[in-house]
């Protein structure tokens, strides 16, 4: 499956929207930094099959969608930007779903990519627990926003690599 150029553009648009979503001066949030343990190895195209990487992207976008769909998230961010962000994520989910089913049979996907999907879920679990522990403070959301931007940037670079390999 050749990940469409539109998917990469969608990822970039999502990153731009995330960048625009900041509400407070992030300089006051240094001490709230946290090691979420981004599962970089899951997205390493050299170690894992393309189908695994794609399903990991899919899970990451799905979890991002879930994270930013909560009522706590709605209270933290600008509604208009959030709606635009949802649309980009939804479009990316559609692109990736088509890609995953093309790469591997639907029945095989769940089993084959279980470990990488689990790693992504645990990563988002750590993010959720961090937000809860920080009582969804503005700084906690800033740190999470920065983290999601970094993980999105990483996966965007990898998608470019996957397209080049084809």
């Amino acid at each position: 499956c050749d990940l469409p150029q539109t998917h990469s553009l969608g990822n970039r648009r999502a990153l731009i929207l995330l960048a625009q979503m900041g509400r407070i001066s992030h300089f006051s949030c240094l001490k709230d930094r946290y090691d979420f343990g981004f599962p970089q190895e899951v997205f390493d195209g050299n170690q894992f099959q393309k189908a695994q990487a794609i399903s990991a992207f899919h899970e990451m976008i799905q979890q991002t969608f879930n994270l930013f769909s909560t009522k706590d998230s709605s209270a933290a961010w600008d509604e208009t930007l959030l709606d635009k962000f949802y649309i980009e994520l939804f479009q990316q989910l559609n692109d990736l779903e088509a890609c995953v089913t093309q790469e591997v049979g639907v029945e095989e996907i769940a089993l084959m990519n279980e470990d990488s999907i689990l790693a992504v879920r645990k990563y988002f679990q750590r993010i959720t627990l961090y937000l809860m522990g920080k009582k969804y403070s503005p700084c906690a959301w800033e740190v999470v926003r920065a983290e999601i931007m970094r993980s999105f940037s990483f996966s965007t670079n990898l998608q470019k690599g996957l397209r080049r390999k084809d």
Partner: antibody
């Protein structure tokens, strides 16, 4: 390869203005903050301030607030440090360094080579 | 502002010696502490970040420890290229602040 390349040495007179630069390459310039550090001759390191090139938000050390201005042009991946009226006491080596912002990653992992500013009448 | 105090301000040691430099913060900074090495005429180089994480490419003879207010940089076996000035820096909150430096000289 990540690089921060600073502009060359400057010799100025007291009262003159100056703008020095720091150009980033080999990484996403807007994904990292750029900090500025002063080192006066024979002295230690002093943090001056920082900028987030993605939105040009800045933070200054109280010691340097109002004395210098930090800016950035993300279209050319360059950060700046400027003075409107130099003093002899501004004579120092000035370094830029990149900072990961709110991400859990090494602070000031890459530094520019430094710009020597000499202010003398 | 958070004050950072390094000790000693200078020390003399021989190649092969174990060297310890301490850094104390005026208030708790958790593990938001970095260590840098600077040689004359050169830019500082990051050695340790988040108190104990070794920066990529830095020899394993360098190690960092501590949390809260008291931190230590240890060089397990001093090498000729290690003679330099070492700075600690807190990255807990703005303004970021450096220690005054510790100069490691040849005995």
């Amino acid at each position: 390869e990540v690089q921060l390349v600073q502009s060359g040495a400057e010799v100025k007179k007291p009262g003159e203005s100056l703008k020095i630069s720091c150009k980033g390459s080999g990484y996403s310039f807007t994904s990292y903050w750029i900090g500025w550090v002063r080192q006066m001759p024979g002295k230690g390191l002093e943090w001056m301030g920082i900028i987030d090139p993605s939105d040009s938000d800045t933070a200054y050390s109280p010691s340097f607030q109002g004395q210098v201005t930090i800016s950035a042009d993300k279209s050319i991946s360059t950060a700046y440090l400027q003075w409107s009226s130099l003093k002899a006491s501004d004579t120092a080596m000035y370094y830029c360094a990149r900072h990961p912002g709110l991400n859990w990653a090494p602070d000031f992992d890459y530094w520019g080579q430094g710009t020597l500013v000499t202010v003398s009448s | 502002d958070i004050q950072m105090t390094q000790s000693p301000s200078s020390l003399s040691a021989s190649v092969g010696d174990r060297v310890t430099i301490t850094c104390r913060a005026s208030q708790s900074i958790a593990d938001f502490l970095n260590w840098y090495q600077q040689k004359p005429g050169k830019a500082p180089k990051l050695l340790i970040y988040f108190a104990s994480s070794l920066q990529s490419g830095v020899p394993s003879r360098f190690s960092g420890s501590g949390s809260g207010t008291d931190f230590t940089l240890t060089i397990s076996s001093l090498q000729p290229e290690d003679f330099a000035t070492y700075y600690c820096q807190q990255s807990h909150s703005f303004p970021l602040t450096f220690g005054q430096g510790t100069k490691v000289e040849i005995k």
